[in-house]
């Protein structure tokens, strides 16, 4: 049902869903801190623009009695329960910041008449693509898929002269929320990735993965997996790996690779890591000082959600436009705003664009080095290291199918 919004007469409220089930196991206190830091910045920006208004956040907590797994598996109804709570209390703000779980976001979007914008730090799955009033501030699975297809097809770089059309995908069901949906998208038979590949097999058992590493009859030299180096080591250990195997490790929300003192362990030599270009001003901020790299990105998405609302509020107020309209609800897309750590770009469907970075391990220095970057906004590759010191023969990535001649 329509809920009246606390969103007029110079007072603008943000409803923040504080759900027990979350994409990342982050103490809600840290998210509150991020939101409050964002509010301070927004108030300052509005004041500087000569807009004398009040902006506040209301934190809506789940009772945690029923939905208590802590991860996203039991999140489907939690979001709806919180919406019901908001509805009963007549406390809906101008914008809803919350659910990070794909299940809950999808269900909330499906089951409610959304005449207000919804901003999510997460909702990675393909089922949350192309939603008219949903904005996602962490890279969704679709963006990953587009990079992978682009990279697979590339054959005009001195270090990648073979187009690839095959892949194994390792997915054992214990993944984090982001990895679960990234791999889910790659697995889906109707996805862009599956459509563009000639061969793709999902490996679900540790042993399957381990056997492929030295199997002379393998159908692909390329294995995609998602997680950090430790996750790979647990699986691979110090096992021998055929020289033309390439492991693509998707680890988007982890900037440890860019730290000065990091040395790549030996088991990473035949691995390409896909991560996001790191921020720099986060390290000293009050809300992120005690956060791990992954949680920093999650908290940052909450903070940027507040800044995005402030950006849109400023535009609408300056134009003398009403905030509680479908126009406002549909406006959170196809724009660039000033985020906490620099400009943030949203695509036509409200999904954040970013610079993905593909790293390799230098056999000379044992350091992670940038091979190339990829701008998801324009789907363009920018080569960085034209003569990488790879472990692979001739400093080139191998063909994806052993024994296939030059292309």
């Amino acid at each position: 049902s329509q809920v009246s919004q606390n969103c007029h007469n110079g007072s603008y409220e943000i409803s923040v869903l504080m759900m027990g089930n979350s994409a990342f196991a982050e103490p809600l206190k840290n998210l509150e801190d991020a939101v409050n830091e964002g509010l301070e910045i927004v108030r300052g920006r509005l004041q500087n623009a000569g807009l004398n208004v009040t902006v506040n956040a209301t934190f809506m907590y789940s009772d945690g009695l029923i939905h208590n797994s802590g991860d996203c598996r039991s999140s489907t109804c939690e979001g709806l329960d919180l919406l019901r709570k908001i509805s009963n209390a007549q406390r809906m703000g101008c914008v809803l910041i919350g659910p990070s779980c794909t299940y809950s976001t999808f269900q909330m979007y499906l089951d409610t008449e959304l005449s207000y914008p919804m901003i999510s730090a997460g909702s990675f799955g393909l089922s949350c693509d192309y939603k008219e009033t949903l904005t996602r501030l962490m890279s969704p699975a679709r963006k990953l898929m587009y990079f992978l297809v682009n990279f697979w097809k590339t054959n005009d770089l001195p270090f990648k002269t073979y187009s690839w059309s095959t892949s194994y995908v390792y997915k054992n069901g214990t993944e984090t929320e982001d990895c679960f949906w990234y791999l889910n998208a790659l697995e889906a038979s109707v996805s862009y990735f599956s459509h563009e590949l000639g061969f793709k097999v999902v490996l679900r058992q540790d042993k399957e993965f381990q056997d492929i590493l030295m199997d002379h009859n393998r159908k692909s030299n390329v294995i995609i997996m998602c997680g950090g180096p430790e996750f790979l080591y647990k699986l691979k250990g110090d096992r021998a790996v055929a020289e033309d195997i390439v492991i693509i490790l998707v680890d988007l929300f982890n900037d440890q690779y860019f730290e000065d003192n990091v040395t790549a362990p030996d088991y990473m030599k035949n691995v390409l890591v896909l991560t996001l270009s790191p921020g720099n001003s986060l390290l000293n901020s009050s809300f992120s000082r005690n956060l791990s790299p992954t949680k920093r990105d999650f908290a940052l998405a909450y903070l940027n959600g507040i800044l995005l609302f402030g950006h849109m509020l400023k535009i609408f107020l300056e134009n003398g436009e009403n905030i509680t309209t479908p126009k406002f609800a549909h406006a959170f897309r196809n724009l660039t705003f000033e985020g906490y750590d620099g400009p943030v770009t949203l695509d036509d469907w409200g999904d954040v664009d970013s610079t993905m970075v593909l790293l390799y391990t230098s056999v000379d220095t044992k350091k992670y080095k940038v091979l190339l970057t990829y701008d998801t906004h324009v789907n363009k590759t920018y080569p960085v290291d034209m003569s990488p010191t790879f472990t692979w023969k001739n400093s080139k990535l191998p063909n994806d199918i052993t024994g296939r001649g030059p292309q």
Epitope: N155, D156, L157, P158, F159, T161, K369, V370, T373, T381, Y382, P383, V384, D385, M386, S387, S395, P406, Q407
Partner: antibody
């Protein structure tokens, strides 16, 4: 409009060094690799090296590894190439060229003539 | 390093002629790139990835080929086309250039 403006011609004595600059404008300097190419009189073009201004990654042609040093000043959107221990065979026109993959070397500077003569 | 051999080195032709320049690579490459250079000027990107015309290049130019043999063709030579054309590969590191083909007025 993309422009690469190089420093003026230089005449140097053998054994000296020279630093050629290439100022970029009309695009984001850190978004594109910058190449350096040598054209000696009557010789084919020779690729010397490439630098990524964002990450500072530099790859040299083995032939020029001990001859050229490539640097950059991102705040000034300028790439530099220094040539050391100059000899007569270093007499050439040196070009900077932007890499706009997949169109390698899509824009070139006007060239800097370096003459080495005693 | 991959060696690129262009033929002919010199070519005399008249306006309106069809002109073909060949570039042979010492080993197979996926793509070839072409540049035009006029006396006293810097090279200009002309054709990239074998057959894509760079911005502003007239449609009378075309590129083709695969493996070790690539060609640049001018369907009807115009006065402004008289220049030197260089082929270049970036299949292997380091990138290398051909020796050039000078197209002169007959």
């Amino acid at each position: 409009e993309v422009q690469l403006v190089q420093s003026g011609a230089e005449v140097k004595k053998p054994g000296a060094s020279v630093k050629v600059s290439c100022k970029a404008s009309g695009y984001t300097f850190t978004d594109h690799n910058m190449n350096w190419v040598k054209q000696a009189p009557g010789q084919r073009l020779e690729w010397m090296g490439v630098m990524n201004p964002k990450f500072g990654t530099i790859n040299y042609n083995q032939k020029f590894k001990d001859k050229a040093t490539i640097t950059r000043d991102t705040s000034a959107s300028t790439a530099y190439m220094e040539l050391s221990s100059l000899r007569s065979e270093d007499t050439a026109v040196y070009y900077c060229a932007r890499d706009n993959y997949p169109n390698y070397f899509d824009y070139w500077g006007q060239g800097t003539t370096v003459t080495v003569s005693s | 390093d991959i060696q690129l051999t262009q033929s002919p080195s010199f070519l005399s032709a008249s306006p309106g002629d069809r002109v073909t320049i060949t570039c042979s690579a010492s080993s197979s490459v996926n793509y070839m790139y072409w540049y035009q250079q006029k006396p006293g000027s810097s090279p200009k990107s002309w054709i990239y990835r074998t057959s894509n015309l760079a911005s502003g290049v007239p449609s009378r130019f075309s590129g083709s080929g695969s493996g070790t043999e690539y060609t640049l063709t001018i369907s009807s030579l115009q006065p402004e086309d008289f220049a030197t054309y260089y082929c270049q590969q970036y299949h292997d590191y380091p990138p290398t250039f051909g020796g050039g083909t000078k197209v002169e007025i007959k």
